[in-house]
């Protein structure tokens, strides 16, 4: 099924992922002690770390283009917060679009 | 058409332990995200719990932090609640519901809900 | 965690009526607020996602607006079938919270 083909792409994303954070810290100049949100991998995709009162914008992620291969990729974006982290807006479901009927081959 | 249907509620003692399943049909059940929300006799909703398309990610109000524990079985198309150490404040109608998303989502779909009652 | 407070706790109105709910944040949730109808013995059912979508299946006189912290929804007419509890809920932060609802009643 798609989503078993998608946890080889997830294991390589992940990897980049963790690789682009460690970069992005480098260049920011963020610790563990630092004001902000901690870069980091939500399971779905990669989100740069931020600081306090930054919005950060990624791409739909890849598992989108196994669910809808022919749909454009749309934009989700994350709120760093005194509090950290906010959940996504739009959830990926309504950013990325979802074929509810699609097939699960 | 979504369907949800909730069991394994009934009376228990304080301080025991509970499971709750949520049989889902009528839609790709391995895709979305699932909640628990739960509503005391005459009282408001309140959201329990949520994890994510694949069981990776899971998310607990305050009051069940510790006690509680969400899983899913994607083969049998099933979502779990483990309640463990209840409290008479525990005594609630527990829906599971659909989140529409791969991570979280909101609550799209309903079940009609599991009665658990906490009583000595 | 954030708080949602709905009022008027109990709207009393008449059949044809305009009804206008309020929902309030305690920190911004940005537009991640949705509205859920309950009836009494029966499920919620998802009204209006996104603050201000609205979805297949919902009659076009149930209406959100609003972002941040302040919230609206409104039923433009109201039939027999809209008397319920009406409950917002944020899905910004986690943990998620519902408000305590609002109970449009028949006057």
């Known amino acids: 099924g798609s989503m078993a083909h998608s946890d080889g792409i997830f294991k390589k994303e992940q990897a980049m992922c963790l690789e682009k954070i460690q970069r992005a810290n480098e260049l920011m100049g963020f610790n563990d002690s630092s004001p902000g949100c901690p870069g980091m991998w939500d399971n779905i995709t990669c989100w740069k770390p931020a600081h306090v009162g930054e919005m950060v914008l990624v791409s739909c992620p890849e598992l989108f283009r196994i669910f809808n291969p022919d749909q454009d990729m749309g934009v989700v974006s994350r709120n760093c917060t005194e509090d950290g982290w906010s959940e996504p807006f739009p959830h990926y479901f309504d950013a990325c679009g979802f074929d509810e009927y699609e097939s699960e081959t | 058409q979504v369907q949800l249907v909730e069991s394994g509620g009934g009376v228990v003692q304080p301080g025991r332990s509970l499971r709750l399943s949520c049989a889902a049909s009528?839609?790709?059940?391995?895709?979305?995200?699932m909640h628990w929300v739960r509503q005391a006799p005459g009282k408001g909703l309140e959201w329990v719990a949520v994890?994510?398309?694949?069981?990776?990610?899971?998310y607990y109000a305050e009051s069940v932090k510790g006690r509680f524990t969400i899983s899913r079985d994607n083969s049998k198309n099933t979502l779990y609640l483990q309640m463990n150490s209840l409290r008479a404040e525990d005594t609630a109608l527990f829906y599971c519901?659909?989140?529409?998303?791969?991570?979280?989502?909101?609550?799209?779909?309903w079940g009609q809900g599991t009665l658990v009652t906490v009583s000595s | 965690e954030i708080v949602l407070t709905q009022s008027p706790a109990t709207l009393s109105l008449s059949p044809g009526e305009r009804a206008t709910l309020s929902c309030r944040a305690s920190?911004?949730?940005?537009?991640?607020l949705h509205w859920y109808q309950q009836k009494p013995g029966q499920a919620p059912r998802l009204l209006i996602k996104?603050?201000?979508q609205s979805l297949s299946g919902i009659p076009a006189r149930f209406s959100g607006s609003g972002s941040g912290t302040d919230f609206t929804l409104t039923i433009s007419s109201l039939e027999p079938e809209d008397f319920a509890v009406y409950y917002c809920?944020?899905?910004?932060?986690?943990?998620?919270?519902f408000g305590p609802g609002t109970k449009v009643d028949i006057k």
């Open positions: 519901a659909r989140g529409y998303d791969v991570l979280t989502g909101y609550p799209d779909y």
């Open positions: 009528g839609f790709t059940f391995s895709r979305f995200a």
């Open positions: 994890i994510s398309y694949d069981g990776g990610n899971k």
């Open positions: 920190k911004s949730v940005g537009r991640s």
């Open positions: 996104y603050a201000s």
């Open positions: 809920h944020q899905s910004s932060r986690l943990p998620f919270t």
